[in-house]
């Protein structure tokens, strides 16, 4: 039987969870486990390296499990913070999975959404002109430059366990 270590499909490097403070943050962890007799499959989250139970954030985790007809298993744990704060958006959210074949972990890419900017340009006659909230950069005619949004406030670290690091036979 071709049993393999757990495979974390989500979170991954291709999907970013971008939220404004006050919004709900939902991060799914979905893990594929190949069938292995008597293996105890586990999935868990850490936030800044700690289990959610050990921190003061109001976080809930909901789990669902589905099986294929060959008894492979997919476990999904959705981490939810109802009203996320700017501090929460700077934390490290890592999904972990373990079976008898090995352990893997993957960080979610979480960042704070920059609100639609409003720029004020001083006109030569002393009046102010305020840019709209389209979220697009508004050229500043005095500087001849585009005013751009802030850099990413936070990009979660990436944790990958390649097979050449971690062999389980």
């Amino acid at each position: 039987k071709n049993a393999v270590p757990p495979v974390i499909h989500s979170p991954n490097d291709h999907v970013v969870y971008e939220k404004e403070p006050g919004e709900e943050l939902l991060i799914p962890c979905t893990v594929y486990f190949s069938f292995l007799m008597d293996s105890r499959n586990e999935v868990w989250w850490t936030i800044d390296g700690k289990k959610p139970d050990d921190i003061t954030i109001d976080v809930t985790i909901n789990e669902s499990i589905s099986h294929s007809r060959t008894e492979d298993e997919t476990r999904t744990q959705i981490l939810s913070i109802k009203k996320v704060t700017s501090e929460d958006l700077k934390r490290s959210y890592v999904c972990h999975a373990r079976s008898a074949k090995g352990e893997v972990a993957k960080a979610a890419k979480v960042k704070q959404k920059v609100p639609a900017p409003r720029y004020t340009v001083e006109l030569a006659c002393g009046f102010g002109a305020t840019g709209g909230g389209s979220g697009k950069p508004i050229p500043n005619p005095l500087l001849g430059l585009d005013s751009t949004g802030l850099n990413d406030i936070f990009e979660a670290q990436k944790i990958e366990w390649h097979e050449h690091h971690h062999h389980h036979h």
Partner: antibody, heavy 118, light 107 residues
Framework: EVQLVESGGGLVKPGGSLKLSCTAS????????MSWVRQTPEKRLEWVAT????????YYPDNVKGRFTISRDIAKNNLYLQMSHLKSEDTAMYYC???????????WGQGTTLTVSS | DIQMTQSPASLSVSVGETVTITCRAS??????LAWYQEKQGKSPQLLVY???NLADGVPSRFSGSGSGTQYSLKINSLQSEDFGSYYC?????????FGGGTKLELK
């Protein structure tokens, strides 16, 4: 330039066997998972098999599990698909693809055709 | 398993038009979606991944959007080289599966 060249397709009777090959060039073969994806005569795409970068782990959907075996020869930059107990529904164009496992396929070969018919 | 439903199955359009192709997942796939283009006689090519990210070398007239179960691929000002078939694919879990495809034909 990434290149993937498949070979080995042909006409096989139901219940028969066939081995497909793919030769890779233009990238470090041992750094990537590789997959076979097929396109049915109705133009549907189906994932068939994946092998991990070092070749230790293989993955299959339920409909080919136990009948198909994916393997690779890292020294030769070759990928293989051994198919047995073939059925008419395995008739398809078989593509070799570089795989950003477990996500998407970023480069595909030109394909080789398998026809399963009596 | 997740099923992907693409619409429309085919579309007759003219050069210069704007086209939107949609893909619906049978369950929430949280933006774990890719789009591919297949031109006549050629193999599929990656266009978009993570629902919105353009693959290297893909022209900016292509854009991906969506969330949850509903996703779309938009092509602004269609060029003659854009005709062909387009497929979505989820990577939310194993098995990864594809939509049935959308064929863009010249009107």
């Amino acid at each position: 330039e990434v290149q993937l060249v498949e070979s080995g397709g042909g006409l096989v009777k139901p219940g028969g066997s066939l081995k497909l090959s793919c030769t890779a060039s233009g990238f470090t073969f041992s750094n990537y998972a590789m997959s076979w994806v097929r396109q049915t005569p109705e133009k549907r795409l189906e994932w068939v098999a994946t092998i991990s970068d070092g070749g230790n782990y293989t993955y299959y959907p339920d409909n080919v599990k136990g009948r198909f075996t994916i393997s690779r020869d890292i020294a030769k930059n070759n990928l293989y698909l051994q198919m047995s107990h073939l059925k008419s529904e395995d008739t398809a164009m078989y593509y070799c693809a570089r795989d950003r496992w477990p996500y998407f396929f970023d480069f595909w070969g030109q394909g080789t055709t398998l026809t399963v018919s009596s | 398993d997740i099923q992907m439903t693409q619409s429309p199955a085919s579309l007759s359009v003219s050069v210069g038009e704007t086209v939107t192709i949609t893909c619906r997942a049978s369950d929430n796939i949280y933006s774990n979606l890719a789009w591919y283009q297949e031109k006549q006689g050629k193999s599929p090519q990656l266009l978009v991944y993570g629902a919105t990210n353009l693959a290297d070398g893909v022209p900016s007239r292509f854009s991906g959007s969506g969330s949850g179960t509903q996703y779309s691929l938009k092509i602004n000002s269609l060029q003659s080289e854009d005709f062909g078939s387009y497929y979505c694919q989820h990577f939310w879990t194993t098995p990864r599966s594809f939509g049935g495809g959308t064929k863009l034909e010249l009107k």
